[in-house]
């Protein structure tokens, strides 16, 4: 396959995410491990200078000193290698100057725990700038323990760079992870350095290791997957919802009922109504009207919206939710005020989410 570079001879375009490097070939500064490195920001009239490494803001620390237009790295390590930029902010504009730092080392291995590189997918460097694999986005790797409910999808990421472009392979419990090792196999997306397993089951529990390697070195990172079997329960309704509401005649109002249920819930909005002037039937049970329920023709059953309300709409509204294990209900009252008694509240159009799975 042809080699390529994300380094392009164009300026940063407005629609590009800021993590894509689109620059002319940067200057390369080479240092040996343990050496100190000093780079001067080659920009004129710089009022304020800010520094980034691989797209991430760079601040001073015990090894990085930022003085005026100078960046000093004390006791350089391979982890300091990367694409640096200094940005000069002026009153009318800003300008950025990019440069590469390459701390040459024999072989890098293991987890680069404190690497804070940016969120690049894969950066292929200048073809003569050989480099062992390195992590490009440790933020996406911080969560090592994944406790995932059965039947969910899980995604493990190991974003990396290197030159030549490293390859990635996956191990399960220290052994080669093959498609036939799980029902339905798994998906690997090399472009995004990730492994996906859909519909996880208890037998998927274990340690998953990505091994990223090229001819100059190898690095690896291990995740632990725990598959949690769901314990079914009756629906749980969020406390305080639906909330009492008031509006003027002709106004609009919304009741929200937030439902937590593993099993598929059925949501009903019910109102006490009167029949022939009575709230109760001959059997002593109240007259109820189902105003809305979840189903094919009902969108967002967790929200009951009432438009152009009249005094007859006042009363108690019940959110009743059931699943195959049991049911729960909570209610709220609607007060309808005459037009001149408008309740003062900020005009806000909001939407509530549907039930939680």
């Amino acid at each position: 396959r042809p080699s390529f570079s994300l380094v392009e001879d164009t300026t940063l375009e407005p629609e590009e995410p800021p993590t894509k490097y689109q620059i002319s070939q940067p200057e390369v500064y080479v240092a040996a491990p343990g050496e100190s490195l000093e780079v001067r920001c080659l920009l004129k009239d710089a009022a304020v200078i800010s520094w980034t490494k691989d797209g991430v803001h760079l601040g001073p620390n015990n090894r990085t000193v930022l003085i005026g237009e100078y960046l000093q790295i004390k006791g350089a390590t391979p982890r300091d290698s990367g694409l640096y930029a200094c940005t000069a902010s002026r009153t009318v504009d800003s300008e950025t100057w990019y440069f590469m730092v390459n701390v040459t080392d024999a072989i890098s291995s293991g987890d680069d725990e404190d690497d804070t590189d940016g969120a690049e997918d894969f950066v292929s460097e200048n073809s003569n700038n050989k480099r062992a694999p390195y992590w490009t986005n440790t933020e996406k790797m911080e969560k090592r323990l994944h406790a995932v409910p059965a039947a969910n999808t899980v995604k493990f990421r190991c974003p990396a760079g290197g030159n030549p472009m490293p390859t990635m392979r996956w191990l399960k419990n220290g052994k080669e992870f093959k498609q036939e090792h799980r029902i339905g196999g798994y998906k690997v997306r090399n472009q995004h350095w990730s492994l996906i397993m859909e519909s996880v089951v208890p037998s998927d529990k274990g340690n998953y290791t990505c091994v990223v390697e090229n001819e100059y070195g190898s690095i690896n990172h291990t995740y632990h997957l725990d598959v949690v079997e769901r314990s079914p329960h009756r629906p749980i309704l969020q406390a305080g919802l639906p909330a009492n509401a008031s509006t003027v005649v002709g106004g609009d109002v919304e009741f929200v009922c937030k439902v937590y249920s593993d099993a598929q819930p059925h949501i009903q909005w019910i109102k006490h109504v009167e029949k022939n002037g009575s709230k109760y039937g001959p059997d002593g049970l109240p007259y109820l009207k189902v105003l809305k329920h979840s189903g094919i023709n009902s969108s967002n059953a967790e929200v009951l919206a009432l438009f152009n309300v009249t005094e007859a709409d006042a009363g108690e509204y019940i959110c009743k939710v059931s699943n195959y294990i049991g049911q729960a209900n909570q209610s709220a009252w609607l007060t309808v005020l005459p037009k001149q008694q408008a309740p003062g509240r900020e005009k806000e159009i909001t939407a509530s989410p549907d039930y939680l799975e």
């Epitope: 995410p17 969910n152 999808t153 997306r189 090399n190």
Partner: antibody, heavy 117, light 107 residues
Framework: QVQLVQSGAEVKKPGSSVKVSCKAS????????ISWVRQAPGQGLEWMGY????????HYAQKFQGRVTITADESTSTAYMELSSLRSEDTAVYYC??????????WGQGTLVTVSS | DIQMTQSPSSLSASVGDRVTITCRAS??????LAWYQQKPGKAPKLLIY???ILQSGVPSRFSGSGSGTDFTLTISSLQPEDFATYYC?????????FGQGTKVEIK
């Protein structure tokens, strides 16, 4: 400026195939994956599949598996989406979209495919 | 596949209103969520990615929040050009799925 330019509208008979092209200009084509997304009249967006030219990866949505083929020609910076065994419900606007970091940042203008006997 | 449930399916609002649209995933998707705006006859336009990062050139009145399963797109003060349909997209699973859309109409 990176742009994705798609081929023109097509009218097809049920049972036939359609091949829509998407040409990239102004950027490194093989650095990114290209996804195809369709939208039936008055409906929402539906992802069909992607191709990652550099990595040589393709992945299709289960719904279109066996009926859709996505290819790319790096020499012309063009991605293609071919949908076979067309039926009336395949009438839609088909979009190509460039993946930046997994999400789609740049879209083609869309190609209307009408399936009618 | 991961299901994305967007609500409401439509809403009417006035210029200057604060508008909130919600998207819920059928399982945790970390922060792998993007929001798009689409106007009739046009391709979708990326507004927000990684749940809360504003795409370059998008006005700051748009903001995103959430994590795990519940996500929100907020337009702090609706402008005439914001009347459109909005979609969420999950990219946690590579079988990408969109929400069904929220049409924001003029009241």
């Amino acid at each position: 400026q990176v742009q994705l330019v798609q081929s023109g509208a097509e009218v097809k008979k049920p049972g036939s195939s359609v091949k829509v092209s998407c040409k990239a200009s102004g950027g490194t084509f093989s650095s990114y994956a290209i996804s195809w997304v369709r939208q039936a009249p008055g409906q929402g967006l539906e992802w069909m599949g992607y191709i990652s030219p550099y990595m040589g990866e393709t992945h299709y949505a289960q719904k279109f598996q066996g009926r859709v083929t996505i290819t790319a020609d790096e020499s012309t910076s063009t991605a293609y989406m071919e949908l076979s065994s067309l039926r009336s419900e395949d009438t839609a606007v088909y979009y190509c979209a460039r993946e930046s970091y997994e999400y789609f940042d740049i879209w083609g203008q869309g190609t209307l495919v009408t399936v009618s006997s | 596949d991961i299901q994305m449930t967007q609500s409401p399916s439509s809403l009417s609002a006035s210029v200057g209103d604060r508008v909130t649209i919600t998207c819920r995933a059928s399982q945790s998707i970390s922060n792998d969520l993007a929001w798009y705006q689409q106007k009739p006859g046009k391709a979708p336009k990326l507004l927000i990615y990684a749940t809360s990062i504003l795409q370059s050139g998008v006005p700051s009145r748009f903001s995103g929040s959430g994590s795990g399963t519940d996500f929100t797109l907020t337009i702090s003060s609706l402008q005439p050009e914001d009347f459109a349909t909005y979609y969420c997209l999950q990219y946690y699973d590579y079988s990408y799925t969109f929400g069904q859309g929220t049409k924001v109409e003029i009241k």
